[in-house]
């Protein structure tokens, strides 16, 4: 008889989760020479150990410590790109601008990007049926705690000028409740980070407003300035042109504003 299993409100663990994580790790270490020393079996053991056999509403950042330790990686100063509610464009940007890095360009972010996972208390099984939803069930679930943990570490280790891409089409361009607003902003280290530069991405082609004057951007500026980090803001009026100009900076049309 199938044993009783807790029903959560969120979707279950991504199909073939262990195989996916291991395969992503192998691929990543093959492509990134500085990570070739990483033992992907150990990385999977650490990932698994963070949530297997544990009640999935009682996961802590400490549970992920072995994984964070094994996946430690360095980002050069001035090369960190944070993002909020505009993941696809941020990733398109770093795919072109290969010397800049989002969290998902790092090993741990790459392993977990777009995946869901959870286990069950006192069994070694992975729950493929359902996992806790952040709102409806609990915030201390395996996926949410993972992203909070690695986002904190990513922000803590940033240095120089840090960039953040923000979605100008949202009602709250800067959202204090986003991972960027609740975790990353507060873990930038003033002794290492000289400035935060926000890129506000416009949605409409005819949108010529200065979204850097938006009240939520002013709120971000205030938070950052109070932490003794300088703040700059730029409007990206034409994201398509912006990407094109990153690819081909010599293009004559790129000499005018984007």
């Amino acid at each position: 008889l199938p044993r009783w299993r807790q029903q959560w409100s969120g979707s279950g663990t991504t199909s073939r989760f262990p195989e996916t994580v291991l395969a992503r790790c192998v691929k990543y270490t093959e492509v990134h020479p500085e990570m070739r020393h990483v033992d992907c079996q150990s990385v999977w053991d650490a990932f698994k150990g963070a949530f297997i056999s544990k009640y999935p509403c009682n996961i802590t950042e400490e549970d992920y410590q072995p994984l964070v330790k094994l996946g430690t990686q360095t980002v050069p100063c001035n090369k960190t790109l944070l993002w909020s509610r505009i993941k696809d464009l941020a990733h398109q940007f770093t795919q072109v601008q290969r010397d800049m890095f989002t969290l998902e360009d790092m090993l741990l972010g790459y392993l977990a990007d777009d995946l869901t996972w959870c286990g069950e208390f006192n069994t070694f099984e992975i729950n493929y049926q359902s996992c806790p939803d952040w709102r409806k069930d609990c915030s201390n679930n395996p996926v949410s705690v993972f992203w909070k943990t690695v986002s904190r570490r990513f922000a803590e280790t940033a240095c120089g000028v840090v960039h953040v891409m923000l979605n100008g089409s949202r009602s709250k361009i800067f959202d204090k409740n986003s991972t960027f607003g609740s975790v990353e902003v507060h873990n930038l280290q003033p002794e290492k980070v000289q400035a935060l530069e926000a890129w506000v991405i416009h949605g409409g082609r005819e949108d010529s407003r200065d979204l850097c004057q938006d009240p939520t951007i002013k709120e971000l500026e205030s938070i950052i300035s109070k932490r003794n980090i300088r703040f700059f803001c730029k409007n990206i009026y034409r994201p398509d042109k912006f990407l094109q100009c990153v690819k081909n900076p010599e293009d004559s049309s790129c000499l005018s504003g984007i």
């Epitope: 500085e34 990570m35 410590q65 072995p66 330790k69 430690t72």
Partner: antibody, heavy 117, light 107 residues
Framework: QVQLQQSGAELVRPGTSVKMSCKAA????????IEWVKQRPGHGLEWIGD????????DYNEKFKGKATLTADTSSSTAYMQLSSLTSEDSAIYYC??????????WGQGTSVTVSS | DIQMNQSPSSLSASLGDTITITCHAS??????LGWYQQKPGNIPKLLIY???NLHTGVPSRFSGSGSGTGFTLTISSLQPEDIATYYC?????????FGGGTKLEIK
């Protein structure tokens, strides 16, 4: 082969500071954590903290925060530990070791610190 | 902090014997356990990492097992050069902690 060469023994006065070194060879220094461990007779082994030379990231045992400061110089593949406000309790052998799978796979020969007036 | 309770604290055995040292963690440490050998006047040396993996150059008479909270180090066919103190160490959470050590003597 992996080697960690530590600086020589130190005899220091109470209240002063000491800085010891750990020079790595035989592997990519920036890719592995360097662990620091204290050993006193009858007290076993105590983990002080570690540093990831590639980014200068550090983690400390709460007990040694304010006592130990870990740094690294990637140009010379050398890790350093400074101990401040020394007392007789700090008399010990201090080891550096390379981190591997959350264990310590290669150890330096140790630096003996004696605090005495 | 995670406590690592090692037993016995001392052990006397004959050459050729098989001996077992145990290490109990005060909370789950998964497989993140290392075993070290320290001969008198020498530096600690890694024997086993990740609970059961033999470190490079370590004789196969050393073996490790366990996961979660209970771990064992087994030395089969005891040799004179095995006289040493053995330590376990957890790497699951900060601060990393060591067991109190097991001093092995030959009868």
């Amino acid at each position: 082969q992996v080697q960690l060469q530590q600086s020589g023994a130190e005899l220091v006065r109470p209240g002063t500071s000491v800085k010891m070194s750990c020079k790595a060879a035989g592997y990519t220094f920036t890719n592995h954590w360097i662990e620091w461990v204290k050993q006193r007779p009858g007290h076993g082994l105590e983990w002080i903290g570690d540093i990831f030379p590639g980014g200068g990231y550090t983690d400390y045992n709460e007990k040694f925060k304010g006592k130990a400061t870990l740094t690294a110089d990637t140009s010379s593949s050398t890790a350093y530990m400074q101990l401040s406000s020394l007392t007789s309790e700090d008399s010990a052998i201090y080891y550096c070791a390379r981190g591997r799978d959350l264990a310590m796979d290669y150890w330096g020969q140790g630096t003996s610190v004696t605090v005495s007036s | 902090d995670i406590q690592m309770n090692q037993s016995p604290s001392s052990l006397s055995a004959s050459l050729g014997d098989t001996i077992t040292i145990t290490c109990h963690a005060s909370q789950n440490i998964n497989v993140w356990l290392g075993w070290y050998q320290q001969k008198p006047g020498n530096i600690p040396k890694l024997l086993i990492y990740k609970a059961s993996n033999l470190h490079t150059g370590v004789p196969s008479r050393f073996s490790g097992s366990g996961s979660g909270t209970g771990f064992t180090l087994t030395i089969s066919s005891l040799q004179p050069e095995d006289i040493a103190t053995y330590y376990c160490q957890q790497g699951q959470s900060y601060p990393y902690t060591f067991g109190g050590g097991t001093k092995l003597e030959i009868k």
